[in-house]
Amino acid sequence: TIQGTNRSSKGRSLIGKVDGTSHVTGKGVTVETVFSVDEFSASVLTGKLTTVFLPIVYTIVFVVGLPSNGMALWVFLFRTKKKHPAVIYMANLALADLLSVIWFPLKIAYHIHGNNWIYGEALCNVLIGFFYGNMYCSILFMTCLSVQRYWVIVNPMGHSRKKANIAIGISLAIWLLILLVTIPLYVVKQTIFIPALNITTCHDVLPEQLLVGDMFNYFLSLAIGVFLFPAFLTASAYVLMIRMLRSSAMDENSEKKRKRAIKLIVTVLAMYLICFTPSNLLLVVHYFLIKSQGQSHVYALYIVALCLSTLNSCIDPFVYYFVSHDFRDHAKNALLCRSVRTVKQMQVSLTSKKHSRKSSSYSSSSTTVKTSY
């Protein structure tokens, strides 16, 4: 969030000075909140970082994230027969990504037009709420998925309705929790008109009063409760999973599973390293510096980290790919422009030819799309 220092210096970051002057009006005394933007803040708001780099990244995220997560949600809801807990968590992950990504055209237009928000305050609040909501939803659903993957290895019992119901319950609880923790983002006034630049910013300029006290406390709480704790759970699940896979007996099938598990771990690790850790760390550091020193020296890094956090919508489909056989099939066929039905028919015809040539019977498992959980 940009703020302007009351020093006329370049290369410093950004504080929103609030003038607490009371103005007596006919209706009584009102306090006007002032949003300070100085030379440096103004140059960030008009510079290449926010008007070129950000829209490029958001365009990539939108172009990749929308179709891949859209397809994933469709596969998990309509093309996966058994709704295992993993499927439920991935469906929610895809939904969270979609709810964030669908607003990206507005975000892209906002940055391209010099950080000028023309779509009204309500839409700005929705965009910001969904932006942060997606990040924290992704962390929590990824944690659930990671713990569930470990649980399957430890406890390889068959699918039960009860397990699916528990997963649905946990998912609903996560959505409710995220809705509650993002309420401040919907309540706070996010659009600010900057006369000198003739622009209305969305979330990029906030008053110092709110920022110094509340924003630091808010993002620190989220970083501990909705990032660090789930991150610890995720890491623990994968460490234990690696141990289990190492000690397990090795056949061709379990070797494939192990490779996929390692790919999944690497993908989730990449997501934490690229998306979640930098953004959560810099959110706290940025607001701490403003709170303690009155200025932040990490503003550019903070901007980049928040931008990179949206890449989770592009990385999530790789998670679906390594976990879900159904998604793998549909993804491969989508990329090869083939339908799953055509592939199935080809598999059936191949199987029947084998049957006619040889007297020995074959298992027709190739005709059904398996799901590896």
């Epitope: 006329s8 003038d19 949003f35 100085d38 103004a42 006369p195």
Partner: antibody, heavy 121, light 107 residues
């Protein structure tokens, strides 16, 4: 001490061009927005053009848009105003001012002594 | 464009007297208002910005107030050096516009 010294004014015929300069000293020039403000003889003040510290954004009123161009050379700590298609109503003393961007707006803190531009045939 | 209307057009005050100059904007300018003083043959000087913030080096006898569309500059304890023309200016919407000026003279 902040100093702004304008030059380039003089008598010019309508339709002709003129370029004003403003040399800035006593501060780090590329840290600040700059503007030109004019004052017709015996009249009030009129804002003419603004430029951001990066030089990437410029702002003009409709009365001069398309005719006047504000620019800066940070290496020379100099502000320019290129005036084309001059009209008699452009006759004024042109002031170069250093802007303070604060509370999200422009405040004209330091002013030069001005340079007189007379547009007459 | 936002029109800035100053009143009175001119006024004279005695030494030590308190004077007020009014400025009316054609629409709300959210306190984005500055006051300038211009002495004969000199460049204008910023006195007040953001309606009520005193610019560094300006005597405390100058004060600004107002909100919405109505703003005023008060000079308490009038001094000889306070003679000149006073302008208000809005910094809320491009183009920045000035009031027509108020000429203050010493009686």
């Amino acid at each position: 001490e902040v100093q702004l010294v304008e030059s380039g004014g003089g008598l010019v015929q309508p339709g002709r061009s003129l370029k004003l300069s403003c040399v800035a000293t006593g501060f780090t020039f590329n840290n600040y927005w700059m503007t030109w403000i004019r004052q017709a003889p015996g009249k009030g003040l009129e804002w003419v053009a603004s430029i951001t510290n990066s030089g990437g954004n410029t702002y003009y009123p409709d009365s001069v848009k398309g005719r006047f161009t504000i620019s800066r050379d940070d290496a020379k700590s100099t502000l320019y105003l290129q005036m084309n298609s001059l009209r008699s109503e452009d006759t004024a003393t042109y002031y170069c001012t250093r802007v303070r961007v604060y509370y999200g707006s422009n405040w004209f803190v330091y002013w030069g002594q001005g340079t007189l531009v007379t547009v007459s045939s | 464009d936002i029109q800035m209307t100053q009143s009175p057009h001119s006024l004279s005050a005695s030494l030590g007297e308190t004077v007020s100059i009014e400025c009316l904007a054609s629409e709300g300018i959210s306190n984005y208002l500055a006051w300038f003083q211009q002495k004969p043959g000199k460049s204008p000087q910023l006195l007040i910005y953001y309606a009520s913030s005193l610019q560094d080096g300006v005597p405390s006898r100058f004060s600004g107030s107002g909100s919405g569309t109505q703003y005023s500059l008060k000079i308490s304890n009038m001094q000889p050096e306070d003679e000149g023309v006073y302008y208000c200016q809005q910094g809320y919407k491009y183009p920045w516009t000035f009031g027509g000026g108020t000429k203050l003279e010493l009686k």
